[in-house]
């Protein structure tokens, strides 16, 4: 008789990242008997939900069920039927929903109610939908990248997981950029975290970590753009806004009502003598950079040092993984290589922004115009945020690693979130040693 292979003893988990601009579903898989080992959970699927973020469904919540269908059906296909009932599903909503909740708690609850009802109809173990805090978003992103880089493992390995991994156990800092917020999280060197709101204490795998984190709401790339437009239109002499952050020849009409829809532009709101205005791109990196800097208030700091807007930031320490939109934007601009210096990045941005809109469209025919038009702003914003906002320098720039995936798993908060909710990160180092390191190779 032939030996039959034993069925794989694996477990699955699903996390939906309900971001401000879109929702993504991630499926994770791990060997059941190695739940407490570091680095054994990996991503097997990402499904990007077609359409905007869930906060945009506030006036059409009856469409949420259909919106989620394709990716939930994909999860049904990927995960063996026998495991459906024990597969947990978590939905975490981030800054887009934080902003909606600021406007109206009832509207946010209305959206989440329908999301929960829709997801509960699938045969998985639905564990609810919630708006995670900015602090959680930062912390879980930090946990994710360090888990995937093997930084929590007590065994120092003679081989490297990823090209930029240093073989020491120093954790990486995490830089996350979304559409509506951005997070910075790292372990400062022997520095007291002067603001309690920014301090986190973890004990992971037998080691204590004092972690600094802050989430800047309204400083994601999309909300930062709305802020910049609202600021600039204040001083426009008519309905034409000549904007250095868009390519020369680019034109777009913006409704003033759309501009003031978000709580992020409230501080710039004023009565304008027109209902619409036209953005006319002039493509000048330096001017764009200057305009962006006006969004960061650096004149006030109640601590020994600050990032901006009076928020404490300790001196930067160690290597950083920059992911989500930091990565997507820099990848598009072909600036993710370890060898590209900050000076070179700035040069490339100057060149890119000054390119005419017609030429830009010709160079990237497959990229949707809406996204294509914003790369000049987004790239400039990333440089401004990292250099002037977080105080990276030309030297420390080399410690920023633009990361999309680590070992096939996306860098982002979702894996850390699931590891925490499924109790898969023990406080103490597990006694049993892993039988193999094959997951790392």
């Amino acid at each position: 008789t032939q030996n039959k292979a034993l069925p794989e003893n694996v477990k699955y988990g699903i996390v939906l990242d309900a971001g401000s601009s879109h929702t993504s579903l991630y499926i994770y898989k791990w060997p059941a008997e190695k739940e407490n080992d570091t680095g054994v959970v990996h991503q097997v699927e990402e499904c990007r939900v077609k359409g905007p973020g869930i906060s945009k469904f506030v006036q059409k919540v009856n469409e949420i069920g259909i919106y989620l269908t394709d990716c939930m059906e994909r999860a049904r296909e990927v995960i063996p039927r026998s495991q459906h009932q024990e597969t947990p599903v978590y939905l975490g909503a981030t800054a887009g929903m934080r902003l909606l909740r600021m406007e109206s708690e009832e509207l946010a609850d209305r959206v989440l109610d329908v999301v929960e009802r829709s997801l509960s109809n699938y045969p998985f173990d639905f564990q609810g939908a919630r708006i995670i805090t900015g602090q959680e978003e930062g912390a879980y992103g930090w946990i994710t990248i360090n888990y995937l880089l093997g930084k929590f493992s007590q065994k120092t390995r003679w081989f490297s997981i990823v090209p930029y991994e240093t073989n020491n156990q120093e954790t990486f800092g995490a830089l996350d950029l979304g559409g509506a917020s951005t997070q910075v999280t790292f372990v400062p060197q022997n520095q007291t975290i002067e603001s309690p709101d920014n301090a986190l204490q973890f004990r992971l795998y037998g080691k204590d970590y004092n972690v600094y984190t802050h989430s800047f709401l309204c400083y994601g790339k999309d909300q930062a753009l709305w802020q910049k437009l609202a600021k600039d239109i204040q001083v426009a002499s008519n309905e034409i806004l000549r904007d250095p952050c868009f390519h020369p020849g680019y034109k777009k009409v913006v409704n003033v009502s759309d501009l003031y829809k978000t709580p992020c532009t409230k501080r710039f709101e004023m009565t304008l003598p027109f209902q619409q205005f036209e953005i006319q791109g002039i493509g000048n990196y330096q001017q764009c950079h200057q305009s962006i800097l006006e969004l960061f208030n650096t004149s006030y700091c109640p601590y020994s040092q600050c990032a901006f807007n009076g928020i404490f930031l300790p001196p930067l320490q160690g290597d950083f993984g920059a992911f989500s939109a930091f990565y997507f934007v820099m990848k598009f601009l072909n600036l993710t290589s370890e060898k590209v210096s900050q000076e070179k990045v700035t040069e490339m941005m100057k060149k890119f922004c000054s390119k005419s809109w017609e030429e830009t469209k010709t160079s990237y025919p497959s990229v949707k115009e809406k996204y294509l038009s914003e790369y000049c702003f987004s790239g400039t914003y990333i440089l401004s945020l990292l250099l002037q906002g977080y105080h990276f320098t030309a030297d420390s720039w080399e410690h920023i690693h633009f990361i999309g995936k680590i070992q096939g798993s996306d860098a982002g908060w979702t894996l850390g979130y699931m590891l925490n909710l499924t109790n898969m990160i023990p406080a103490e180092q597990p006694l049993s040693t892993p039988l193999s390191h094959s997951t790392y190779v």
Partner: antibody, heavy 121, light 107 residues
């Protein structure tokens, strides 16, 4: 004060379907979820499913998925629960109940009087 | 799904005495817990929601406590009309789930 009035008792044959109605009066109908809960003779309470009439969005317990359909008619402030492929184990009192806490608060504050459904050949 | 377990199944108490009913959730439900009273031939009636808030018209002798996974319903001094079956229900996650009930009977 909100009141829920359900349709009368039913006797059904195995394999058939039953549709129970629940009419609301004296309060907002659309915004609050309506849940359906059943109770077999001498047994506890079992949640079957729910709907928010405002959106027509229903969700169901896995056990009843594919066999139960919950709908609502805003114009008449009435919710309906239809259970198909009836078997003897479906003999129970079926209650509608209003989720009186608003969105995401599913405490059942107001109950109908119950509808006895007997499944017998 | 979240499993709700009630104990005891039956509680025999004399009128005027205190009754303490327990409810345990298989995972944390925060304070998303309700208690219902059901008398024979009647629909259930909401007594407590949010683990400890009395529903309107519910006498002060009924009180709820607890959060997370352990909850208690206390009837400080049982009246004749309080002899009934009591159910707990979690409403944090779908599906909504009820405990098996505690029958409070006259001793």
């Amino acid at each position: 004060q909100v009141q829920l009035v359900q349709s009368g008792a039913e006797v059904k044959k195995p394999g058939s379907s039953v549709k129970v109605s629940c009419k609301a009066s004296g309060g907002t109908f659309s915004k609050y979820g309506i849940s359906w809960v059943r109770q077999a003779p001498g047994q506890g309470l079992e949640w079957m499913g729910s709907i928010i009439p405002e959106f027509g969005i229903a969700n169901y317990a896995q056990k009843f998925q594919g066999r139960v359909t919950i709908t609502a008619d805003e114009s008449t402030s009435t919710a309906y629960m239809e259970l198909s492929s009836l078997r003897s184990e479906d003999t129970a009192v079926y209650y509608c109940a209003r989720e009186s806490g608003g969105y995401r608060d599913h405490r059942l504050g107001v109950w109908g009087q119950g509808t006895m459904v007997t499944v017998s050949s | 799904e979240i499993v709700m377990t009630q104990s005891p199944a039956t509680l025999s108490v004399s009128p005027g005495e205190r009754a303490t009913l327990s409810c345990r959730a298989s995972q944390s439900v925060g304070s998303n817990l309700a208690w219902y009273q059901q008398k024979p031939g009647q629909a259930p009636r909401l007594l407590i929601y949010g683990a400890s808030t009395r529903a309107s018209g519910i006498p002060a002798r009924f009180s709820g406590s607890g959060s997370g996974t352990e909850f208690t319903l206390t009837i400080s001094s049982l009246q004749s009309e309080d002899f009934a079956v009591y159910y707990c229900q979690q409403y944090l996650l779908w599906p909504l789930t009820f405990g098996g009930g505690t029958k409070v009977e006259i001793k």
